[in-house]
């Protein structure tokens, strides 16, 4: 399992992981106490046939070619959590591990 | 976590799981001894903002709107394995659980 890493200067057109810092303050999400910003990353790019396919299933669907199947798209294939401190709906302070907040790898699925 | 289930008669345009039987015999993939066919399913449909989003990350990337981010696409969000009997490259018969062969749920990611 591997994936490409790119940045804003890359000329790569294929599915790639790009850096992205999410800034909760800039969104006005004041219920998030910490972190105020974090490195989230995102996926973008083209999925040519077989390139970076995460699952054999993706290849099989391509072979079978059913009506309306739109070929694979560039999407997170490995994600990780971050720890956050935030207010819940009852205005209690919660500290917890929030899953799937950081993209570690991108692939075609 | 939930996802829509559709069939070939559905008029649903949103991201949905559709039935698909993969037939290895029809592909001529005779190195797969068994099963000769199995129910794989696939994902198809539109991902309107927030509909069936699997990760908070998807929402955050939409908010941040970086260059080249293409919005979420309809992709498997839950998959399961099947047991297979097949010949490897050395013509040894292998029996094993092959991960991510069946789509159990589709979502926007």
């Amino acid at each position: 399992d591997f994936g490409l890493d790119c940045d804003e200067h890359s000329t790569e057109s294929r599915c790639c992981r790009y850096p992205l810092t999410v800034d909760f303050e800039a969104f006005g999400w004041d219920w998030i106490i910490a972190p105020k910003r974090y490195k989230a990353n995102y996926c973008s790019g083209e999925c040519e046939f077989v390139f970076l396919q995460k699952y054999p299933h993706t290849h099989l669907v391509h072979q079978a070619n059913p009506r309306g199947s739109a070929g694979p798209c560039c999407t997170p294939t490995k994600m990780s959590p971050i720890n956050m401190l935030y207010f819940n709906g009852k205005e209690q302070i919660i500290y917890g591990k929030i899953p799937a907040m950081v993209v570690d790898r991108c692939g075609c699925s | 976590d939930f996802g829509l289930d559709c069939d070939e008669h559905s008029t649903e345009s949103r991201c949905c799981r559709y039935p698909l039987t993969v037939d290895f015999e029809a592909f001529g993939w005779d190195w797969i001894i068994a099963p000769k066919r199995y129910k794989a399913n696939y994902c198809s449909g539109e991902c309107e903002f927030v509909f069936l989003q699997k990760y908070p990350h998807t929402h955050l990337v939409h908010q941040a709107n970086p260059r080249g981010s293409a919005g979420p696409c309809c992709t498997p969000t839950k998959m399961s394995p099947i047991n297979m009997l097949y010949f490897n490259g050395k013509e040894q018969i292998i029996y094993g659980k092959i991960p991510a062969m069946v789509v159990d749920r589709c979502g926007c990611s």
């Epitope: - | 015999e25 005779d30 190195w31 000769k36 047991n83 009997l85 010949f87 013509e91 029996y95």
Partner: antibody
């Protein structure tokens, strides 16, 4: 429907060879194991071996390994069993049979279709 | 090789009888046992596989049971067409081995 049609009866002299054919129809020949079993007159069944036509991977009963050869012709969907150095106790009906996979485990098989059998008589 | 010992070697019974044939393996065969029926001049026909599963189209009067080394084929109510020779087969390991057969005759 799935069918296995075997070649006709043979009479051979001791020391000779015989090649029995089994023509498959009604299914994808290359993707199913073909087995060979024999039955001497008034006796029980004896497993000779099997072959996977896609890549000709085969297994033999040690009793026959030195004298038997299993082959296939994919272009005609035909399996063959050749037995060399024939002796009088090789006189038997020889059957081909398709092995069908029914389950999820590595040994989940059964014989679902048999050929009609080929009588091989070894006599001087 | 795994030895399969079938008993009895022959059996006389009447129409309507319930009969039992047994097969004993020389070691545990993990329920990888099939039962066959063979009529004179014909190829064998699979009745039961995996010790107790009935092949599609085989009447439910045939049933199989057992585990480990001991297995049984039962025919609940004999009909004239059931008089034949019955064989067991182990497929747990190569070489596959058959029992010597049980000839079921009309009394």
């Amino acid at each position: 429907q799935v069918q296995l049609v075997q070649s006709g009866a043979e009479v051979k002299k001791p020391g000779a060879s015989v090649k029995v054919s089994c023509k498959a129809s009604g299914y994808s020949f290359t993707g199913y194991f073909m087995h060979w079993v024999r039955q001497a007159p008034g006796q029980g069944l004896e497993w000779i071996g099997n072959i996977y036509p896609y890549n000709s991977v085969s297994n033999y009963n040690q009793r026959f390994k030195a004298r038997a050869t299993l082959t296939v012709d994919k272009s005609t969907s035909t399996a063959y069993m050749e037995l060399r150095s024939l002796r009088s106790d090789d006189t038997a009906v020889y059957y081909c049979a398709r092995r069908y996979y029914y389950g999820t485990g590595p040994a989940d098989w059964y014989y679902d279709v048999w050929g009609q059998g080929t009588l091989v008589t070894v006599s001087s | 090789d795994i030895q399969m010992t079938q008993s009895p070697s022959s059996l006389s019974a009447s129409v309507g009888d319930r009969v039992t044939i047994t097969c004993k393996a020389s070691q545990d065969i993990n329920s990888y046992l099939s039962w066959f029926q063979q009529k004179p001049g014909k190829a064998p026909k699979t009745l039961i596989y995996r010790a107790n599963r009935l092949v599609d189209g085989v009447p439910s009067k045939f049933s199989g049971s057992g585990s480990g080394t001991d297995y049984t084929l039962t025919i609940s109510s004999l009909q004239p067409e059931d008089f034949a020779t019955y064989y067991c087969l182990q497929s747990d390991e190569f070489p596959l081995t058959f029992g010597q057969g049980t000839k079921l005759e009309i009394k």
